[in-house]
């Protein structure tokens, strides 16, 4: 696993990462805790601490060395060097900078074999970013008059997102105001503690509900928006069933 806090963290978990030697049970290196190795891509803000772990066993106890971009990783390769904690099978780099970006490979070997695992480190100069909306959502939908429909907007934002559902409307038969800007109606919006703002549900729809629905998301950094179209069919006409999308409406922080 990797940490990205401002302070180094001690390894306090009780998993047996360090396997004692037993001459009668010689074996090649093996991973002892693959869960800690599942996340291969780590995007970490600059100045934070990163820790990569490769918990392993073997008999005799394997040695561990680290490569950066396929080459031997030496202390002089980065300002401030790095720490290797062999008993925890970890590599620790403090106060990472953009030049630390790259692939880090732990090479674990003994006389009976060798195994390796590669992590990719991306150092981001500044983490909070504009909201990112999942592609394809909200999805176009169609229903008959009197039917119900749901639009889903999946938001990824590492700062508090404000979500709005907006529809283009007409005033006095016109879609645009004197200033040339479209008439818009906010149908739903999120407060700080509002739940389910990522879902817009329309019930008992009429032909007037047909049109473009916009999911507009903002955080203090920037904005993002995506839209979908609702087609409302006469009652006698069955809707064209689109591929059903089952996406969790919760935004990820």
């Amino acid at each position: 696993d990797a940490i990205s806090s401002g302070d180094d963290e001690d390894d306090t978990d009780s998993s047996e990462d360090f396997v004692s030697e037993n001459r009668s049970n010689q074996r090649a290196p093996y991973w002892t805790n693959t869960e800690k190795m599942e996340k291969r891509l780590h995007a970490v803000p600059a100045a934070n601490t990163v820790k990569f772990r490769c918990p392993a066993g073997g008999n005799p106890t394997p040695t561990m060395r680290w490569l950066k971009n396929g080459k031997e990783f030496k202390q002089e390769h980065r300002i401030g060097g790095y720490k290797v904690r062999n008993q925890h099978w970890s590599l620790i780099m403090e106060s990472v900078v953009p030049s630390d970006k790259g692939n880090y490979t732990c090479l674990v070997e003994n006389e009976y074999g060798s195994i390796n695992h590669t992590y990719h480190l991306d150092v981001v100069e500044r983490s909070p970013h504009r909201p990112i909306l999942q592609a394809g959502l909200p999805a176009n939908a169609s229903t008959v008059v009197g039917g119900d429909v749901e639009f889903v907007c999946k938001v990824y934002s590492d700062a508090q997102p404000h979500i709005q559902w907006i529809k283009h409307v007409e005033k006095n038969g016109s879609k645009y105001g004197p200033d040339g800007l479209p008439y818009l109606k906010v149908l739903k919006h999120s407060g700080i503690n509002s739940s389910n703002a990522e879902v817009l549900a329309l019930f008992n729809v009429t032909e007037m509900d047909a049109g473009e629905y916009i999911c507009k998301v903002s955080n203090y950094i920037g904005q993002a928006n995506q839209s979908a179209w609702l087609t409302v069919l006469p009652k006698q006409q069955a809707p064209v069933r689109e591929k059903e999308i089952t996406a969790s409406p919760d935004y990820l922080e």
């Epitope: 909070p128 590492d158 508090q160 700080i192 903002s218 950094i221 920037g222």
Partner: antibody
């Protein structure tokens, strides 16, 4: 290098208006909210509002609504903050800031009769 | 508006000391930012999203907390750390700042 460069100090009379500019460079101006924050002498920081240059969306602090106007000119990557009906307690340093980590150098506005 | 109350309002400490500044919010928040400001200068971002160090900020600064209680810690004060510190919430309009904590040399 990211820079937010603000216009120079202003001295105004009560009841007048002031318009402060903030020119952005080194990043995509339209992609990020431009916030305006002020600081009265010896006081803390106060958020006034923000404009999203891409589409002109604006959020105001209700305390200033009706007196503050935020605009932008995307062709020159510049945001503006105009404060009207000035009072003596509007004497402050006015900052533009984007993303929280980019700040202008501040513009001192003095309101005095 | 969400009110942020910092404590203490002022603090005297020595080089090498460990210092903690707290920020209490009138409503629960997802995140907190912390700024350092020196006289005549614009604020400088130290911590964003509660615990993330801004680029170029020394690792002696750290942030923590959740809900209504947040903390900025300086593990070992350096001469250049004497300044005023502000917490800020970017979660709910209008965005608000704490009243500030002035850190002075003892």
């Amino acid at each position: 290098e990211v820079q937010l460069v603000q216009s120079g100090a202003e001295v105004k009379k009560p009841g007048a208006s002031v318009k402060v500019s903030c020119k952005a460079s080194g990043y995509t101006f339209t992609n990020y909210w431009m916030h305006w924050v002020r600081q009265a002498p010896g006081q803390g920081l106060e958020w006034m509002g923000a404009i999203y240059p891409e589409n002109g969306d604006i959020n105001y602090n209700q305390k200033f609504k009706g007196r503050v106007t935020l605009t932008r000119d995307t062709s020159i990557s510049t945001a503006y903050m105009e404060l009207s009906r000035l009072r003596s307690d509007d004497t402050a340093v006015y900052y533009c800031t984007s993303r929280g980590d980019y700040w202008g150098q501040g513009t001192t506005v003095t309101v005095s009769s | 508006a969400i009110q942020l109350t910092q404590s203490p309002s002022s603090l005297s400490a020595s080089v090498g000391d460990r210092v903690t500044i707290t920020c209490s919010a009138s409503s629960g928040l997802s995140y907190m930012s912390w700024y350092q400001q020196k006289p005549g200068k614009a604020p400088k971002l130290l911590i964003y999203d509660t615990s993330n160090l801004a680029s170029g900020v020394p690792s002696r600064f750290s942030g923590s907390g959740s809900g209504t209680d947040f903390t900025l810690t300086i593990s070992s004060l350096q001469p250049e750390d004497f300044a005023t510190y502000y917490c800020q919430q970017w979660s709910s309009y209008p965005y608000t700042f704490g009243q500030g904590t002035k850190l002075e040399i003892k």
